[in-house]
């Protein structure tokens, strides 16, 4: 990915998305009614000119924004302790990652804007979450909507790093 | 390109234990669920149930609990329909389709070609 | 269960008729409401979901409308293609249940 984001980093983000599974607590079955339209913005990551600054930008705001869903008294509440200690952990990790990568991409003269705008766009979508999670009253169905969303579009972006990669690939070996 | 492919027709005679399967490609498999719908002859569309294959979870519809029985093998990317005594009215058209869960997406957007299962003695 | 009403259970009409089918829900269902139409020999085939989000690749001669228990399936223009059974469905809650259908018959 342009530097040295090591390779385990896809292993973590599937990690993650494993984590993310075995935290189901109910039947998602019992919690059709409470779907939502969270309007996630598909085109910030099916895109097929993709730059590092981009997918490195979208990939840290989305696991920050996880992060912070995550760390907060009532998803304490709502899900177990152990296994949101590892999320924690292995979410930690990857931003870390990603951190060190993003500041290299910034040196390198990439565009402050394929930085920022993803940035603003994800928080308002993470906003929308969060104001359906209180509406809900953070009932054991609305998280578990909120999980099942959570893991479509960490396996969307995951992907989008994916595409890089083999982009990257491709260019290297021609 | 999406795609659920069912197994071919079969005919049985009742007493007789049948499992048809669904098979799915070019999605992520555990990422949806598959839901069974029959046709009788000339019928409408009725829903029987339904599983999601990242754990093999199922819900069934009150009219056909207990009498089929849905499993998936997610390392085959593949859902099946199980009858473990066939009746003359089962005799019917069989569809598996897609569902996206608890995600805000189309309901049912991909079918398979359908397996018809017919009982006579 | 969800019951669904659909009205006509058939109709007849020609080729460029504005055609209407109607779907009533026993219950509040906000907009999960899905339209499907089948024809002989056929699986069926997505048109219309969650109300009136017409789904990819369906001509924009149909349309959908509706929320809560009453919802509405509009043919703008009939073409040849378009003769065929049309069901609804709700996603609301289990058991999904579906309309009886609506056979739409060539006058």
């Known amino acids: 990915l342009g530097c040295d984001l090591p390779q385990n980093h896809g292993l973590l983000s599937r990690n993650t998305l494993v984590l993310l599974h075995q935290m189901r607590r109910i039947s998602p079955f019992l919690c059709l009614k409470d779907r939502r339209d969270f309007r996630f913005p598909q085109e910030m990551v099916k895109g097929s000119q993709l730059q590092k600054a981009h997918v490195m930008s979208v990939l840290h705001e989305m696991l920050q924004q996880i992060f912070s869903l995550f760390h907060t008294e009532r998803s304490s509440a709502a899900w177990n302790m152990t296994l949101l200690d590892q999320l924690h952990t292995g979410l930690h990790q990857q931003l870390q990652h990603l951190e060190t990568c993003l500041l290299q991409v910034v040196g390198e003269g990439e565009s402050a804007g394929a930085i920022s705008s993803p940035a603003l766009t994800l928080r308002r979508y993470f906003q929308g979450i969060r104001v359906y999670l209180k509406e809900k009253k953070y009932s054991d169905c609305a998280w578990e909507v909120v999980r099942m969303e959570i893991m479509k579009s960490l396996f969307l972006s995951t992907n989008m790093q994916e595409r890089l990669r083999s982009k990257d690939r491709d260019l290297g070996s021609s | 390109e999406v795609q659920l492919v069912q197994s071919g027709a079969e005919v049985k005679k009742p007493g007789e234990s049948l499992k048809i399967s669904c098979k799915g490609s070019g999605y992520s498999f555990t990422s949806y669920w598959i839901g069974w719908v029959r046709q009788m002859p000339g019928k409408g569309l009725e829903w029987m149930g339904i599983?999601?294959?990242?754990?093999?979870?199922?819900a069934y519809s009150p009219s056909f609990q207990g009498q089929v029985t849905i499993s998936a093998d997610k390392s085959i990317s593949t859902a099946y329909l199980q009858w473990s005594s066939l009746k003359a009215s089962d005799t019917a058209m069989y569809y598996c389709?897609?569902?996206?869960?608890?995600?805000?997406?189309?309901?049912?957007?991909?079918w398979g070609q359908g397996t018809l299962v017919t009982v006579s003695s | 269960d969800i019951q669904m009403t659909q009205s006509p259970s058939s109709l007849s009409a020609s080729v460029g008729d504005r055609v209407t089918i109607t779907c009533r829900a026993s219950q509040s269902i906000g907009k999960s409401l899905n339209w499907y139409q089948q024809k002989p020999g056929k699986a069926p085939k997505l048109l219309i979901y969650?109300?009136?989000s017409l789904q990819s690749g369906v001509p924009s001669r149909f349309s959908g409308s509706g929320s809560g228990t009453d919802f509405t399936l509009t043919i703008s223009s009939l073409q040849p293609e378009d003769f065929a059974t049309y069901y609804c469905?709700?996603?609301?809650?289990?058991?999904?249940?579906f309309g009886q259908g609506t056979k739409v018959e060539i006058k």
């Open positions: 469905q709700q996603s609301y809650d289990f058991p999904l249940t």
């Open positions: 389709a897609r569902h996206p869960g608890l995600n805000w997406a189309p309901d049912f957007d991909y």
């Open positions: 969650f109300a009136s």
């Open positions: 599983i999601d294959p990242s754990d093999s979870d199922t």
